[in-house]
Every structure is written in structure tokens, then in C-alpha cells.
Amino acid sequence: SIPWNLERITPPRYRADEYQPPDGGSLVEVYLLDTSIQSDHREIEGRVMVTDFENVPEEDGTRFHRQASKCDSHGTHLAGVVSGRDAGVAKGASMRSLRVLNCQGKGTVSGTLIGLEFIRKSQLVQPVGPLVVLLPLAGGYSRVLNAACQRLARAGVVLVTAAGNFRDDACLYSPASAPEVITVGATNAQDQPVTLGTLGTNFGRCVDLFAPGEDIIGASSDCSTCFVSQSGTSQAAAHVAGIAAMMLSAEPELTLAELRQRLIHFSAKDVINEAWFPEDQRVLTPNLVAALPPSTHENLYFQ
Amino acid sequence: GAMGQEDEDGDYEELVLALRSEEDGLAEAPEHGTTATFHRCAKDPWRLPGTYVVVLKEETHLSQSERTARRLQAQAARRGYLTKILHVFHGLLPGFLVKMSGDLLELALKLPHVDYIEEDSSVFAQ
């Protein structure tokens, strides 16, 4: 049966026993800046082109054991959430991956900047259709990272990022705080903000909307046919990247402002229990859970 | 995210260093009174001192970026400091990534075309 997260973002017209919008997102390329990925996993084989870009810091600790499946875990899961054959949002989207996070899931602002520059240069060398850039990472507020995101957005690229898993104001983190980036918080099957250990999803006015981000089934790098459940604002951002890819595939000429407006327009409104947020943040945090457009757009979104 | 907000610095630390001296006889000395700023991550454990992104003013060409980076290296060498240019940015932002001692920040902030300098910091999978 359809996983809860795909059901949640799917308009009622499509809630049959399976989620299968044919070829969704096929005109769009989604760039993923994350860990290395297992690109031949059955769920994503042929859908993800691993670029030769790699800029990661060394792993911490003298006894760190580099295990390939662990190194690939985060990125493989997110690639599956965006475009996986069976558990993905935009099953027609093609992806390109850049490695900016090491085997411990750690990267640098500078490595991320160089990755964003790589995408811009690729775009200039070989202009393709609409581009979505997924940044499932967060660091402290960074003027330079926000500036780079702004420049890339002004070049027509749609950037989607994780709000952060710090149960804190997203405005204190980057790239979540960049105004031009679509910043995504995480909700669960009960439309509650996601709790992650002692922390949880970030919130506040720098968040644009929420999306499913708890117990999300996706490709596991443990084996080539394995699936695993993962949680976080990265998973939430991956849903929105997939939805954006489908919207842009249906309407390639959409501007960033129009896309943002559509994402907000089609979101479920006022379903999140705001009591989870600090009192002073409730009015500032958008009560929106991302969803695909309804069946009136069948000809556009499910062509 | 969330368009329409003002710039939000939060706990972000900003250190403004006024450009007082004109030592080293810079050929393209900055205009009087302009200041380049230094930024670093407010979360101490995430800081990566020793690596800095030197961001140059918007219209700076690649050749000027390279020249500015070389000038920094030359001036640092005269003071007995080793520096390494790790990357020269162009395409999105003009500037360069440099590995150097924090002692050289004041010198770097006085270079021509410099808009601001940011200390590198960590990002994490979410």
C-alpha cells in the first residue's frame, strides 16, 4: 500500500492503492548536494548521474572506519525520496549528485559554495531545462552561503533546503535563512512537527512550508534492493524538491516567485498543531504542509 | 527561506575592522572610509579557523580576484606567514578560499576589492 508520506502529498483523486503519476518531473534536473550515493540501487538506477564533484572534509576521529554503505546512506535515501521508482515523489525526474558531505554527514560552507559554483558553471556550459537544487544540510548562519544561494536563484535555479533539525529558529541557520531558498520543515503522519531525539524540526519565519519528514521509506544503501525509514528536515526538503520538479515539468516557464506561490497555494492549511512551537514563534511559522496540485491539473501534472 | 524578510543575522558574529593604515603601498588602495567586515559562525564548535572565504565586491573580474589572492600571499610572505589559495571563485561570487593564520585577517581586510571575509564553518546532513 502507498506509504503515508506519498499519500499525504497526493491529491485525493489519486489516492488509489498506489502512487504513480506517470513520468512526473521528466523535464527537470534535480541537483543533490549531499553524501556519496549508491547510484545503482534498484530504486534509482539510471536516474542519478554521479558528477565528479567532491569536496568534503576528512572524517573526525582516528578510529573512523569508512564503510561504503554508511557513507552512501543519507544521499541514497534522499535520491530515492525525490525520484525513486516505488517510493519516490517525482518518478520521472533525473538527478545529478555532488558529494559535499563526508561519511559522517559533515561538510563545510566552502565546499558547499564550490558545489553551487559547479552547478552554475554546468548550467552555463550546457543549458538544459529547469533546475532544482536540493540542499539537505545546515550550518550556522552564513552570509556567504546565503549570498551564493541568492545569486544562483537569480540565475533561475530553484533551491530547496532543510530547515534544520535543531528545534530552533531556522533564521539562525544557513542556507535555511536565505530568503530566495525554499526552506522546508518536517511534519509526521499526525501533522505534528517532527521531534528528533531531544530536538526536532526548526521553525519560524524563515521556514516556507512543511512536508513529511518522519518515518519516510526510501532506498537504503545497505543493499541494492533494500529500503529503510529515515527522518529529518532533509527528507521533508526532498519531498518539496520532488513536488517542485513535477510543477516545473508541467510548467517549465514558472518563475521562482510563481513556483513558491503555487507550493503555498496547494499546501494543506492549518493542519499543524502549533502548540509544539515556542509561543513567540507560532504566529511566525507557516502552517502549511506541502502537497501536489489537485486533479483539476491532471493534464499538466500527470501527463 | 521565506521571502520578504529583512536580513537576519541572529547570533551571527560580525567584526568590523576599519581600514586605517595604507601600509604596503597598495596600488589600488580602498576608498577612504570604506570597511570590509569579518564574519564567523556563532556556534563555536562549528567554526573552522584557518580557512577563510574572501569575498570580493560584486563586479570584480576573475583576473582581479587572482591578483588580489597573489597580493595577499606576497604580503603574508613578507611577514613570514605561509598561505595557500585553495580555490578562486568566479561564476557565482567573486573571491577566493585561503588557508592562512587568523593573524593575517587585518591585512586581508585591507586588500583592494574585498567586500567581506568569512571564516569557514561546518555544515551537517539533516
Epitope: E18, Q20, P22, Q38, S39, D40, R42, E45, G46, V48, M49, V50, A68, R85, D86, K91, C223, S224, T225 | -
Partner: antibody
Framework: QVQLVQSGAEVKKPGASVKVSCKAS????????ISWVRQAPGQGLEWMGW????????NYAQKLQGRGTMTTDPSTSTAYMELRSLRSDDTAVYYC????????WGQGTTVTVSS | QSALTQPASVSGSPGQSITISCTGT?????????VSWYQQHPGKAPKLMIY???NRPSGVSNRFSGSKSGNTASLTISGLQAEDEADYYC?????????FGGGTKLTVL
């Protein structure tokens, strides 16, 4: 263009081993593994397993029961399928195909097991 | 796991439409979006005709179409032509492997 080229026909005695090769070209190797499929004379297709060019991982069909080994050599863009302790019912055409999706196939390698 | 169930043979006249069924379980056909169909002419390697239930690879005639309902997938060939005479195999994911149907011999009368 995307191509899978297999090694030539083999005749083996029962109990012997055979190693079939499959050279891939025209695409990014690490984006797909290689599936191995066999077809006995007059019979249908049988999936034998899959091997990764990315990390060498394998996924074998239960029926192989440890008699088969699949490997890859990314430096030569070649995948291999070795079958040991051959029996007469292993007589078949052995195909390699690209990935689990099996969208491109090799020309097939006939393996005859006969005493 | 056992093979998916296909009819041993079907036939049709040129210009007609035929449908080949492929029945599995909720653990294979019913549980995944990844049903493929292959055409195989005698002495030749199989050729992919339909992937992921209903998608056609480039170069495959639009006379070939695929669909799925529950645990049964179907291949429909419209406007039958002589060159369509061949064996047809369905294939599906299972949780850890892949399974083929027994094959259907299509005869164009």
C-alpha cells in the same frame, strides 16, 4: 551507443566451471549494475542475479545455491559470471543485461554441458 | 519464488488487438511499480518493450502499451503486424530479486 558484448560459446564437462564475460560501453557504469539471465533450450527466462560496478555488491537468486559468483572489473568495464559444478541442466544461453531494469541486453553466450 | 503466470499462447490476425496477461501476487506485481515486458524473436536476445508498468522506451512502437490492476499486469498490442510474432515475457521486482513470467507465444495468423 549503449552496448553489452559477451564472450563466445563454451562447451564444458559436468563438474567443470565456466566464466562468462560481459563488456559494457556507452554509458556511466556506476549508474547501473549488471543482471545475469539464462534461458535453457525451449524454456523461458530465468533471473540469476545482479552485480554492482559501483561497489562489487551482489544479489543472487536463491536457486544458484552458492554455485555462482558474479564479479565486476570497473577498470575494463567488464562483468563476469562464473558457474561451478556444472550439470547438464545448466546448458543454456546466458545473457547479461543492464541493471535491474534490463533495458539493454548482451547477445548471449551459449554454454553446453555435456559428457 | 515461482514464475509469474502468463498464458502459454495467444493469437490474432493482422490489424487486430491482443492482450497478454501476467498474474503475480502482492509481493511482486501488486507491490511494485516496476513491471516490464520483453519481446524475443527466435535465436535473438530479449528486447525491452515496456518498463515501469506503462512506459515505452524510445524506438518502441506506440502500438505497444502496458497497464496494471492489482496483482495482474497486461501488455496490449494494437494493429497487429507480422513482425510482432514472437515470445513475450513479463518481469517484476520482488522484495529482494526479480521474477519472470513463463512466456507467451504470440502467433500472427
Amino acid at each position: 551507443q549503449v552496448q553489452l558484448v559477451q564472450s563466445g560459446a563454451e562447451v564444458k564437462k559436468p563438474g567443470a566451471s565456466v566464466k562468462v564475460s560481459c563488456k559494457a560501453s556507452g554509458y556511466t557504469l556506476t549508474s547501473y549494475g549488471i543482471s545475469w539471465v539464462r534461458q535453457a533450450p525451449g524454456q523461458g527466462l530465468e533471473w540469476m542475479g545482479w552485480v554492482s560496478f559501483y561497489n562489487g555488491n551482489t544479489n543472487y537468486a536463491q536457486k544458484l545455491q552458492g554455485r555462482g559468483t558474479m564479479t565486476t572489473d570497473p577498470s575494463t568495464s567488464t562483468a563476469y559470471m562464473e558457474l561451478r559444478s556444472l550439470r547438464s541442466d545448466d546448458t543454456a544461453v546466458y545473457y547479461c543485461a543492464r541493471g535491474y531494469g534490463m533495458d539493454v541486453w548482451g547477445q548471449g553466450t551459449t554454454v553446453t554441458v555435456s559428457s | 519464488q515461482s514464475a509469474l503466470t502468463q498464458p502459454a499462447s495467444v493469437s490474432g490476425s493482422p490489424g487486430q488487438s491482443i492482450t497478454i496477461s501476467c498474474t503475480g501476487t502482492s509481493s511482486d506485481v501488486g507491490g511494485y511499480n516496476s513491471v516490464s515486458w520483453y519481446q524475443q524473436h527466435p535465436g535473438k536476445a530479449p528486447k525491452l518493450m515496456i518498463y515501469e508498468v506503462s512506459n515505452r522506451p524510445s524506438g518502441v512502437s506506440n502500438r505497444f502499451s502496458g497497464s496494471k490492476s492489482g496483482n495482474t499486469a497486461s501488455l496490449t498490442i494494437s494493429g497487429l503486424q507480422a513482425e510482432d510474432e514472437a515470445d513475450y515475457y513479463c518481469n517484476s521486482y520482488t522484495s529482494t530479486s526479480m521474477v519472470f513470467g513463463g512466456g507467451t507465444k504470440l502467433t500472427v495468423l
